[in-house]
């Protein structure tokens, strides 16, 4: 499955919006830094693992959407930027949905995807528990925003690589 060029542009727009959403200096939150253990191995790999990576990226965007859709998130960010961010994520989910649907029913891909989907889910569980532990403080949200930016950047580069291999 080939992702449309617009998908990559949407990804970049989402990254720009995430950057714009920053309200406080990252340096003032250094004490709150945390290693969430981004499951990079899920997104690495060869062409055979392309379906796995796309499926995992869909899960990542879906979990990001859910994370930023909570009432705690709404209180933390600028409403206009947040709404624009939702739109970009929604569009990306639509693009990826078509790709993942094509692979549904392929047995070896399904087995591979179990672990990759669970790895992404666990990553977001760590983020969720971190935010709760920090009582959704402004610095906690800033750390999470920066983390999501890093993971999006990584997967954007991955998708460029996948397109080149095609």
């Amino acid at each position: 499955c080939d992702l449309p060029q617009t998908h990559s542009l949407g990804n970049r727009r989402a990254l720009i919006l995430l950057a714009q959403m920053g309200r406080i200096s990252h340096f003032s939150c250094l004490k709150d830094r945390y290693d969430f253990g981004f499951p990079q191995e899920v997104f690495d790999g060869n062409q055979f693992q392309k379906a796995q990576a796309i499926s995992a990226f869909h899960e990542m965007i879906q979990q990001t959407f859910n994370l930023f859709s909570t009432k705690d998130s709404s209180a933390a960010w600028d409403e206009t930027l947040l709404d624009k961010f939702y739109i970009e994520l929604f569009q990306q989910l639509n693009d990826l949905e078509a790709c993942v649907t094509q692979e549904v029913g392929v047995e070896e891909i399904a087995l591979m995807n179990e672990d990759s989907i669970l790895a992404v889910r666990k990553y977001f569980q760590r983020i969720t528990l971190y935010l709760m532990g920090k009582k959704y403080s402004p610095c906690a949200w800033e750390v999470v925003r920066a983390e999501i930016m890093r993971s999006f950047s990584f997967s954007t580069n991955l998708q460029k690589g996948l397109r080149r291999k095609d």
């Epitope: 859910n66 994370l67 949905e97 993942v100 549904v104 569980q125 760590r126």
Partner: antibody, heavy 119, light 108 residues
Framework: QVQLQQPGAELVKPGASVKLSCKAS????????MHWVKQRPGQGLEWIGE????????IYNENFKSKATLTVDKSSITAFMQLSSLTSEDSAVYFC????????????WGQGTLVTVSA | QIVLTQSPAIMSASPGEKVTLTCSAG???????LYWYQQKPGSSPKLWIY???NLASGVPARFSGSGSGTSYSLTISSMEAEDAASYFC?????????FGSGTKLEIK
């Protein structure tokens, strides 16, 4: 508020199939995986599998792969589970439960459908 | 698959008594993915404790959870009549997700 509606009961004959439904409301249906869980009378809970309503990807417990088929209908925001070649061992209450994270994992359950397999 | 063994299968406690239910995993489970559910007859399970030690919304403070690796527990500091129910531990650390066989807690 989040709600998952399931019919109360289904009576089916041995060897037949049954399709159970779980109608969602109060949240964006396509954003959360839907899980199915089996409970035999007076017994524990068994995880059957899950489906992502967004793209239809399914993940099954190997023990139920030849028994259950999970599907969704996005237009009616409903998840389905078809159980085939029914025997008395399949008589149980079947719950749907919504995925999530942290305090949202399996925080929402349907009331359950009692399936009775009897001639 | 990870087998979760709960003990005892049935127990009864007097009001005010301290109660501890245990859940033993066949292989190690990350504490972030160990949950407890309460179920009363004729009802669906309710999320009770998530990630080993966090109480779900509305759960009384007399409940607590602890553990790591293969050994987990749910404790009630002072039993009350409304606590009579079945309690199931659950893991989603690895596929297939599994539940314990449950402990039925009765009031004396």
């Amino acid at each position: 508020q989040v709600q998952l509606q399931q019919p109360g009961a289904e009576l089916v004959k041995p060897g037949a199939s049954v399709k159970l439904s779980c109608k969602a409301s109060g949240y964006t249906f396509t954003n959360y995986w839907m899980h199915w869980v089996k409970q035999r009378p007076g017994q524990g809970l068994e995880w059957i599998g899950e489906i992502n309503p967004s793209h239809g990807r399914t993940i099954y417990n190997e023990n139920f792969k030849s028994k259950a088929t999970l599907t969704v209908d996005k237009s009616s925001i409903t998840a389905f589970m078809q159980l085939s070649s029914l025997t008395s061992e399949d008589s149980a209450v079947y719950f749907c439960a919504r995925g999530g994270l942290g305090p949202a994992w399996f925080a929402y359950w349907g009331q359950g459908t009692l399936v009775t397999v009897s001639a | 698959q990870i087998v979760l063994t709960q003990s005892p299968a049935i127990m009864s406690a007097s009001p005010g008594e301290k109660v501890t239910l245990t859940c033993s995993a066949g292989s190690s489970v990350d504490s972030s993915y160990l949950y407890w559910y309460q179920q009363k007859p004729g009802s669906s399970p309710k999320l009770w404790i998530y990630s080993t030690s966090n109480l779900a919304s509305g759960v009384p403070a007399r409940f607590s959870g602890s553990g790591s690796g293969t050994s987990y527990s749910l404790t009630i500091s002072s039993m009350e009549a409304e606590d009579a129910a079945s309690y199931f531990c659950h893991q989603w650390s690895s596929y297939p997700f599994t539940f314990g066989s449950g402990t039925k807690l009765e009031i004396k």
